[in-house]
């Protein structure tokens, strides 16, 4: 069974940011800014054809 | 530090797992200057089909 889409789970550390409780709440400015920067960054990295997008962003303490 | 976890979606056959990781790793320097994000400990794996069918591409 083929969906025509490949999915990859990616995890990484951002060592110059501090985790706090606002990263557990998607309505906070901190959460939304970081999510926007990360989404924009991935569009830059995988700008060649084939990249469909990202989902399920989660932030955890490092 | 902050650990970021996410799912990436690509058209099937357009990229292998090695290049997903390599292209991300090669961008780390630019991420630091452009977004002020110091990235380390990158890990990439493929998502088994049943999970990926549910997750969709955002």
């Amino acid at each position: 069974l083929s969906t025509g889409v490949s999915f990859f789970f990616l995890s990484f550390h951002i060592s110059n940011l501090q985790f706090n409780s606002s990263l557990e709440d998607p309505s906070t400015d901190y959460y939304q800014e970081l999510q926007r920067d990360i989404s924009e960054m991935f569009l830059q990295i995988y700008k060649q054809g084939g990249f469909l997008g990202l989902s399920n962003i989660k932030f955890r303490p490092g | 530090s902050v650990v970021v976890q996410l799912t990436l979606a690509f058209r099937e056959g357009t990229i292998n797992v090695h290049d997903v990781e390599t292209q991300f790793n090669q961008y780390k320097t630019e991420a630091a200057s452009r977004y002020n994000l110091t990235i380390s400990d990158v890990s990439v794996s493929d998502v088994p089909f049943p999970f990926s069918a549910q997750s969709g591409a955002g």
């Epitope: 060649q48 054809g49 | 099937e12 990229i15 292998n16 390599t22 090669q26 493929d46």
Partner: antibody, heavy 120, light 107 residues
Framework: QVQLVQSGAEVKKPGASVKVSCKAS????????MHWVRQAPGQGLEWMGY????????HYNQKFKDRVTITADKSASTAYMELSSLRSEDTAVYYC?????????????WGQGTLVTVSS | DIQMTQSPSSLSASVGDRVTITCRAS??????LVWYQQKPGKSPKLLIY???TLTSGVPSRFSGSGSGTQYTLTISSLQPEDVATYYC?????????FGQGTKLEIK
């Protein structure tokens, strides 16, 4: 037409190093990744590593990581593979092979091969 | 590392026979599977990539199939010029391992 022309056969003593060259022509050298593969006499193919000549990014098979160095000279459209601390088991034909362009996961052109013999 | 296991390691068949070579990966390689043909004393030649896409100039008697961990190269009607060793290759993740090869001979 695309051509990958490799340097000639070499005979080396154990412990020495060898540097094999691969001169590319007929395409833009910096836009295709170049891999190195070896084949011991009567044996199968073994992937050693690659270089992206545009960015100079390299990735090596862990088996060879401490002994192999792959480089590229953009101005000469030439890739090099240097293997150090040679031992008799390194006697093989060494091939350069071009990986197809974006989303092309295969080796579409191969060099003619360079026989490296390690013998005391 | 992903191990690639080819079978059989050698086979002998008659001209006109249908020949099948299989390649098993130790993990899912998501169709990033390549087949090469190598004739004695020559460099390998690309036959099939993405498990089933035939390279331009390769005769249509060659075909590839499979998915996940199991892949097959089929020659529908063996010709004398098909005498060679055939290799599969994992192109999903490094190291980009090859199968040990299948030596094909004519009876």
């Amino acid at each position: 037409q695309v051509q990958l022309v490799q340097s000639g056969a070499e005979v080396k003593k154990p412990g020495a190093s060898v540097k094999v060259s691969c001169k590319a022509s007929g395409y833009t050298f910096t836009t295709y990744t170049m891999h190195w593969v070896r084949q011991a006499p009567g044996q199968g193919l073994e992937w050693m590593g690659y270089i992206n000549p545009g960015s100079d990014y390299t990735h090596y098979n862990q088996k060879f990581k401490d002994r192999v160095t792959i480089t590229a000279d953009k101005s000469a459209s030439t890739a090099y593979m240097e293997l150090s601390s040679l031992r008799s088991e390194d006697t093989a034909v060494y091939y350069c092979a071009r990986q197809g362009n974006y989303a092309a996961y295969y080796f579409d052109y191969w060099g003619q091969g360079t026989l490296v013999t390690v013998s005391s | 590392d992903i191990q690639m296991t080819q079978s059989p390691s050698s086979l002998s068949a008659s001209v006109g026979d249908r020949v099948t070579i299989t390649c098993r990966a130790s993990g899912n390689i998501h169709n990033f599977l390549v087949w090469y043909q190598q004739k004695p004393g020559k460099s390998p030649k690309l036959l099939i990539y993405n498990a089933k896409t035939l390279t331009s100039g390769v005769p249509s008697r060659f075909s590839g199939s499979g998915s996940g961990t199991q892949y097959t190269l089929t020659i529908s009607s063996l010709q004398p010029e098909d005498v060679a060793t055939y290799y599969c290759q994992n192109f999903w993740n490094v190291p980009f391992t090859f199968g040990q090869g299948t030596k094909l001979e004519i009876k």
